[in-house]
Interface confidence: low
Amino acid sequence: EVEKTACPSGKKAPEIDESLIFYKKWELEACVDAALLATQMDRVNAIPFTYEQLDVLKHKLDELYPQGYPESVIQHLGYLFLKMSPEDIRKWNVTSLETLKALLEVNKGHEMSPQVATLIDRFVKGRGQLDKDTLDTLTAFYPGYLCSLSPEELSSVPPSSIWAVRPQDLDTCDPRQLDVLYPKARLAFQNMNGSEYFVKIQSFLGGAPTEDLKALSQQNVSMDLATFMKLRTDAVLPLTVAEVQKLLGPHVEGLKAEERHRPVRDWILRQRQDDLDTLGLGLQGGIPNGYLVLDLSMQEALS
């Protein structure tokens, strides 16, 4: 901690400028007025202060604003943002997207730090929902952002924001997250024609129910195997061989390479071997002719 000491004669800082890099820590504490610093925060970033000097400047702002900084100061924190703790950030009220962008820029290229996570949390809670502009901004800086949210948090995403989501933003989402996002995407894209709709909805299909997959199979969509492999197992199991063939189109041949992996493996076990044979892919493991097909979900429920 820097002791409060009288400022030496002639060293009182009239403005925030390069000359301050030559000040000792105690001189910065004594000679830089906190209100002046707040007013000229935008200059701090252009001056090569040491980490120790930045600590002093942070203390001066804390002294002025112990319950949290005003947004005008936050927007110009620059590299001083990296000195903030999550506890500091929880006291902020950030409402401007420009402020959010300015601070995310400081952390660009790095993993999402606890500070950034707290900042985003404060910002989104302040807005009440993840609107399109916010989502656009966050996914631009952190493509995995959407998949870092809990299903509960994702529930506050309005369908209109789904337009901002790119396929790579969903790469790390698990089925529970896609369960929440899929109905929103379905609503967002509902007025598009068939082929355009499929292009947009494809990334979200990991949350699609059986009936929607059946409907898609009637539309000549030619789903690729990578998308098929991400579908919910429980949604794929009730599909018939004919429906899967229509759904995948020319990509159906890829089933052979995936026959030992879920959901293909589990789906094969549910199909009549005769039906599988019609695909001409040599898929094995179906139900032999003459066997009674039980509803496995009922069987599981009873066992």
Partner: antibody, heavy 112, light 112 residues
């Protein structure tokens, strides 16, 4: 030098409303939190609330939630305190302040 | 809310002597940055309050070094060495750690 200039004394009737002003000189208004504090006759100091003029975010003391509204006009560097449903209990000196700078106070008298 | 207690409502003192004024909070005022957010104000008769000490022990600008602040966590002391006539007034402590900001009831410094 920072100066806070408050509006003049006011005499109002019970049940009425009043709007007190506080203009800031010598400081970038958006870089401040403007606080309001009241002092009843022969009493201590009570914190009413504060505003962040950069985004109009305001916070109030529990006692003043339904009594006070703090606003700010950045074009004139002025903070306002609006007090409603006035009673004789609201007779007091009202101060605006910023960190170590206090206004001279506005005396509000509520009387029929 | 954090409750601030100033046990002595008045403190008689002889000019030239030293005096200590105490203040307690019912919750620690220690911030995560290591500072105690305890402020001392003096309100001279007929004037607005003005800041003497901020962050428990830091002298505000223009305040004579006869004033000093100390304490830790929940117990704080304002010490005035060599009391002068101009030091007469009511001394208030205030916590600036969290909302709502709260003041002590004040201690009146009187000359014997």
């Amino acid at each position: 030098e920072v100066q806070l200039q408050q509006s003049g004394a006011d005499l109002v009737k019970p049940g009425a409303s009043v709007k007190l002003s506080c203009t800031v000189f010598g400081l970038n208004f958006k870089d401040t939190f403007m606080h309001w504090v009241r002092q009843r006759p022969e009493q201590g100091l009570e914190w009413i609330g504060r505003i962040d003029p950069a985004n109009d975010n305001s916070i109030y003391g529990p006692k003043f939630q339904d009594k006070a509204t703090i606003t700010a006009d950045t074009s004139s560097n002025t903070a306002y305190l609006h007090l409603s449903s006035l009673t004789s209990e609201d007779t007091a000196v009202y101060y605006c302040l910023y960190f170590d700078n206090w206004g001279h106070g506005t005396t509000l008298t509520v009387s029929s | 809310d954090i409750v601030m207690t100033q046990a002595a409502s008045s403190e008689p003192v002889t000019p030239g002597e030293s005096v200590s004024i105490s203040c307690r909070s019912d919750k620690s005022l220690l911030h995560s940055n290591g500072h105690n957010y305890l402020y001392w104000f003096l309100q001279r008769p007929g004037q607005s309050p003005h800041l003497l000490i901020y962050r428990m022990s830091n002298l505000a600008s223009g305040v004579p070094d006869r004033f000093s602040g100390s304490g830790s966590g929940t117990a704080f002391t304002l010490r005035i060495s060599r009391v002068e006539a101009e030091d007469v007034g009511v001394y208030y402590c205030m916590q600036h750690l969290e909302y709502p900001l709260t003041f002590g009831a004040g201690t009146k410094l009187e000359l014997k």
